[in-house]
C-alpha cells in the first residue's frame, strides 16, 4: 500500500525440538478482534492457512499442522506441540475487523547434538607424508541448526594452515530434519605430535544460550624414522654368574626397526650375531663369564634398508672360579699342626673365610687357616668361602675333610634300654676313628653297617629279646688298625609302673643318633618309653 511503513521485524520465538511453541498473536485491540483471527504458516514465501479462530473458538485446517495446534490464553495464543526442525518458519496471525492487520512470528528451532564421536586414523600418520593426512574425524549427530566444530591440539584451537592443517566439514540431513555434522581433520604431523592430545568441540545454540560439547581426548599413532639406537642391560649394576641378564636393543623410531645384537669376538676381532627372542631381546640365563664382552645393536629400516649402529656396550659378568684347597684330603696325627690354603680367581677382589662345617663358626678371615695341636675333635669338615664383597651373592665354596688318626671312639660307653620279652629289638651303635673302624656285636642277629662320613660308622642290629639276653646285655665293639673300643647296652624289662598315662598311645619305633663330637648318646630303637635316668 503506497505510503505504508515497512513491515516490522517478526517477533522471535525460540524452542527446542519436541517441545511446545507458544505463538502469541500480538495484534492490539485496535488492529483487530482476537476472537476472529486466521493463522498462516509461511514457507518459501507461500502462505498456508493452518488455523481459524471464530468467536474465540479454534479450528485446525487439514494438513501437516492439523493434529498439533490448539488455542490457549483465551484465544490469544496458538500452541504448536511436538516441534520439529521443519517448523522453523514464519507464522502470522491476521485479524479480520475493523481492518485486516497481521502480526508475524519467526519460530526458531534448536536441538543439541549428541556427544561428539571422535575417531583416530586406525593406521596412524607418517611424518614424512607429502600432503596432509586424515588424522581424525569428529561426528556430531542430530543437532539443529548445524553445530560449529573446533579442533584442538594440546588444548589450543587448530587453525587452517596451507599444506599443514585442513579441516573438512560436511553435513547430512536426517529424515527427522536434524543435521549430522562430520568434520575431518587433515594435517601433516611431526614427531613431537606422538604425545599430542587432540579433541573436537561442537558449539551450538539453544533457547537458553550458547553451549558446547567436547569429545574425549585422543592421541594419534605417529610414525617417524629411527635416528638413534642404543642398548640397555637389565638388571642394572654389577652382574654375576647365574643372573638372568637381558640385553635389549632400543630405538627412537616408530614403529621400532628390525634389530640384531652382535658380540665382538676378541680372538677373531669380528662381531658374531647373537640369537635374540621375538622382541629382539638377548636373554642370558644363566649368565656366564664367557658372556662378558662388547655388544652392539644394529637397527634396520626394512623399507629403506638403511641400518644404524648403537654405541658398543661392555658387558662384564662377574665370576668366582672353582675354589681350590690344599691339601685336598688332609690326614694328621693328634697333637700335630696343619695349614690349609684356599685359592680362587675372580673378576673382582676376593675375600676368603674359613668356617667349621658343623657349626658354621668363622675360624679365619683370609685364604690361610692354621691349626695347631690337633685334637681328635678337630676332625671333620672345614669350608673355604671365596666371595666378592661388592656383589652380594657372588661366592663359591669348597669343603675339605680333616681326618685325625686315632683308635675307635664310641658315641657312648654304656646305655640302658627298656624292652619287653620276645620283642624284636633294633639296637644301634656308633663309632668314629681314622682309619674308619668296623663294628661287631657279641650276640647273633641281623646287623647292617652304614658310613656316616669317612671317619664315622653306624651299625644297627635286629635281635629277639630272650631271658639270656636280658641277663647278659649286648656289647658292640669297634676296631681299626690303631685299636678297639666297646659299648655296652643293658636291657631292662618294662613294668607297668614305668609307663606314663599316655605313653601306651605311642607305638611307633624311633631312632635317634648323636654326633660323637658332642658325646651325646646314641639310642637303640624300640617302643618310645620315658627315660628313667640320664644316660651317660
Amino acid at each position: 500500500v503506497p505510503g505504508e511503513a515497512e513491515q516490522p521485524a517478526p517477533e522471535l520465538v525460540e524452542v527446542e525440538v519436541g517441545s511446545t511453541a507458544l505463538l502469541k498473536c500480538g495484534l492490539s485491540q485496535s488492529q483487530g478482534n482476537l476472537s476472529h483471527v486466521d493463522w498462516f504458516s509461511v514457507h518459501k514465501e507461500k502462505r498456508t492457512l493452518i488455523f481459524r479462530v471464530r468467536q474465540g473458538q479454534g479450528q485446525s485446517e487439514p494438513g501437516e499442522y492439523e493434529q498439533r495446534l490448539s488455542l490457549q490464553d483465551r484465544g490469544a495464543t496458538l500452541a504448536l506441540t511436538q516441534v520439529t526442525p521443519q517448523d522453523e518458519r514464519i507464522f502470522l496471525c491476521q485479524g479480520k475487523r475493523p481492518r485486516s492487520q497481521e502480526y508475524r512470528i519467526q519460530l526458531r528451532v534448536y536441538k543439541a547434538p549428541e556427544e561428539p564421536n571422535i575417531q583416530v586414523n586406525p593406521l596412524g600418520i607418517p611424518v614424512n607424508s607429502k600432503e596432509p593426512e586424515e588424522v581424525a574425524t569428529c561426528v556430531g549427530r542430530n543437532g539443529y541448526p548445524i553445530p560449529q566444530v573446533i579442533w584442538y591440539k594440546n588444548g589450543r584451537p587448530l587453525k587452517e594452515e596451507k599444506n599443514r592443517v585442513h579441516i573438512q566439514s560436511s553435513q547430512t540431513v536426517e529424515s527427522s530434519g536434524l543435521y549430522t555434522l562430520q568434520s575431518i581433520l587433515k594435517a601433516q604431523l611431526v614427531k613431537e605430535d606422538k604425545d599430542a592430545q587432540f579433541y573436537c568441540e561442537l558449539n551450538y545454540r539453544l533457547p537458553s544460550g550458547n553451549h558446547m560439547k567436547e569429545s574425549r581426548e585422543v592421541t594419534v599413532p605417529v610414525f617417524y624414522p629411527t635416528e638413534k639406537v642404543w642398548l640397555e642391560v637389565e638388571p642394572v649394576g654389577m652382574l654375576k654368574e647365574g643372573d638372568r641378564v637381558e640385553i635389549r636393543c632400543l630405538a627412537d623410531g616408530n614403529p621400532p626397526p628390525h634389530f640384531s645384537i652382535s658380540k665382538g669376538n676378541p680372538s677373531t676381532r669380528e662381531a658374531e650375531e647373537e640369537t635374540t627372542n621375538d622382541n629382539g631381546v638377548l636373554v642370558l640365563e644363566p649368565a656366564r663369564k664367557e658372556h662378558s664382552g662388547r655388544y652392539e645393536c644394529q637397527a634396520w629400516n626394512l623399507d629403506t634398508m638403511i641400518s644404524l649402529l648403537s654405541e658398543p656396550q661392555e658387558l662384564l659378568v662377574n665370576y668366582v672360579s672353582d675354589v681350590r684347597v690344599s691339601p685336598a684330603a688332609p690326614e694328621r696325627q693328634e697333637g700335630s699342626s696343619l695349614t690349609l690354603t684356599c685359592e680362587a680367581e675372580s673378576s673382582q677382589d676376593l675375600e676368603f673365610q674359613w668356617l667349621r662345617e658343623e657349626t658354621d663358626q668363622v675360624l679365619e678371615r683370609g685364604p690361610v687357616l692354621q691349626l695347631h695341636d690337633l685334637k681328635r675333635e678337630a676332625g671333620g669338615g672345614y669350608r673355604c668361602v671365596a666371595s666378592v664383597p661388592s656383589i652380594p651373592g657372588l661366592n663359591r665354596t669348597q669343603l675339605v675333610k680333616l681326618a685325625i688318626f686315632g683308635p675307635p671312639w664310641m658315641a657312648f660307653k654304656e646305655r640302658k634300654v627298656w624292652v619287653k620279652e620276645n620283642m624284636v629289638l633294633n639296637l644301634s651303635c656308633e663309632a668314629s676313628g681314622h682309619p674308619r673302624p668296623t663294628i661287631s656285636w657279641n650276640v647273633n642277629g641281623t646287623a647292617s653297617e652304614g658310613d656316616q662320613d669317612p671317619q664315622r660308622v653306624l651299625s644297627t642290629l635286629n635281635v629277639l629279646v630272650t631271658p639270656e639276653l636280658l641277663e647278659t646285655g649286648v656289647e658292640c665293639t669297634a676296631s681299626n688298625d690303631l685299636g678297639k673300643n666297646t659299648s655296652i647296652l643293658f636291657l631292662e624289662l618294662v613294668n607297668l609302673t614305668t609307663l606314663t598315662p599316655d605313653s601306651n598311645t605311642t607305638t611307633g619305633l624311633s631312632t635317634s643318633t648323636a654326633s660323637p663330637h658332642t658325646r651325646a648318646n646314641s639310642t637303640s630303637t624300640e617302643r618310645k618309653l620315658p627315660e628313667p635316668e640320664s644316660r651317660g
Epitope: P122, I125, E134
Partner: antibody
Framework: QVTLKESGPVLVKPTETLTLTCTVS????????VSWVRQPPGKALEWIAA???????YYNSAFKSRLTISRDTSKSQVVLTMTNMDPVDTATYYC??????????WGQGTLVTVSS | DIQMTQSPSSLSASVGDRVTITCKGS??????LAWFQLKPGKVPKLLIY???SLQTGIPSRFSGSGSGTDFTLTISSLQPEDVATYYC????????FGGGTKVEIK
C-alpha cells in the same frame, strides 16, 4: 556412482609374485584411501594393506616383507604386489574404499589360486 | 592386535524372525565398528558404521548398537534376501574382522 574392480591372474605358482590391480571410478584416489582385504576359502576376512589419500602406505605386519602397494592417480588404479606366493595365499582378494576410516564401497573380489 | 570375536558362527531362523549377532572386542574400541554383509559373487555391502549408524540405502530392519567392547547387529524381521555371511570389523587400531556369522532361512 562409486565402483571398484579388481583384476589380475586367477592362478599363480608357488614362489611366484602376484600383482593385482584395483581400478576405481566415482571418486579420486587423492580424496580417499584404498585398502586390500582377502578371504581364504571358508575363513574370515583379513586386511592386507592400504594406501592413503596422501599416498602413505600401510601393511599388515604378518605379510609386510612380501607386500608393496602403490597407486597411479592418473589411471585411478591401486596396485598390490605380493611376493613368494604360497598355497595358503589362495583367497578372494578385494579392494575397498575408505570413508574416511571404515570401508564404504568394495569391489566384487577376484579369486586367486596358488598351485603348481 | 585387537581381536574381534563374533557369535554365533551360524544360525538358522524363519522369515520374519528377529535375528541378533554379537561381536566382542579384546579391548575398548569405543564406537569404531562396522558391520558388513557378504554374499557369494556379490560386492560386499556396508550395513552399519560407527557402531550404530545405518549406511545410506540399507533397509531400516538392520540396526547396530553397542560401544566399548560389546556390539550387536540386529535384523528386526528376517527376509529371504538377508541370507548371507555377516562380519564385524574394528577400525580403532588397524583393521581386524570377526570370524563371521552365516545366516540361513529355516
Amino acid at each position: 556412482q562409486v565402483t571398484l574392480k579388481e583384476s589380475g591372474p586367477v592362478l599363480v605358482k608357488p614362489t611366484e609374485t602376484l600383482t593385482l590391480t584395483c581400478t576405481v571410478s566415482g571418486f579420486s584416489l587423492t580424496s580417499n584411501a584404498v585398502s586390500w582385504v582377502r578371504q581364504p576359502p571358508g575363513k574370515a576376512l583379513e586386511w592386507i594393506a592400504a594406501i592413503s589419500s596422501g599416498g602413505s602406505t600401510y601393511y599388515n605386519s604378518a605379510f609386510k616383507s612380501r607386500l608393496t602397494i602403490s597407486r597411479d592417480t592418473s589411471k585411478s588404479q591401486v596396485v598390490l604386489t605380493m611376493t613368494n606366493m604360497d598355497p595358503v595365499d589362495t583367497a578372494t582378494y578385494y579392494c575397498a574404499r575408505h570413508r574416511p576410516f571404515y570401508f564404504d564401497y568394495w569391489g566384487q573380489g577376484t579369486l586367486v589360486t596358488v598351485s603348481s | 592386535d585387537i581381536q574381534m570375536t563374533q557369535s554365533p558362527s551360524s544360525l538358522s531362523a524363519s522369515v520374519g524372525d528377529r535375528v541378533t549377532i554379537t561381536c566382542k572386542g579384546s579391548q575398548n574400541i569405543y564406537k569404531s565398528l562396522a558391520w558388513f554383509q557378504l554374499k557369494p559373487g556379490k560386492v560386499p555391502k556396508l550395513l552399519i558404521y560407527d557402531a550404530n549408524s545405518l549406511q545410506t540405502g540399507i533397509p531400516s530392519r538392520f540396526s547396530g548398537s553397542g560401544s566399548g567392547t560389546d556390539f550387536t547387529l540386529t535384523i528386526s524381521s528376517l527376509q529371504p534376501e538377508d541370507v548371507a555371511t555377516y562380519y564385524c570389523q574394528q577400525y580403532y587400531s588397524g583393521y581386524t574382522f570377526g570370524g563371521g556369522t552365516k545366516v540361513e532361512i529355516k
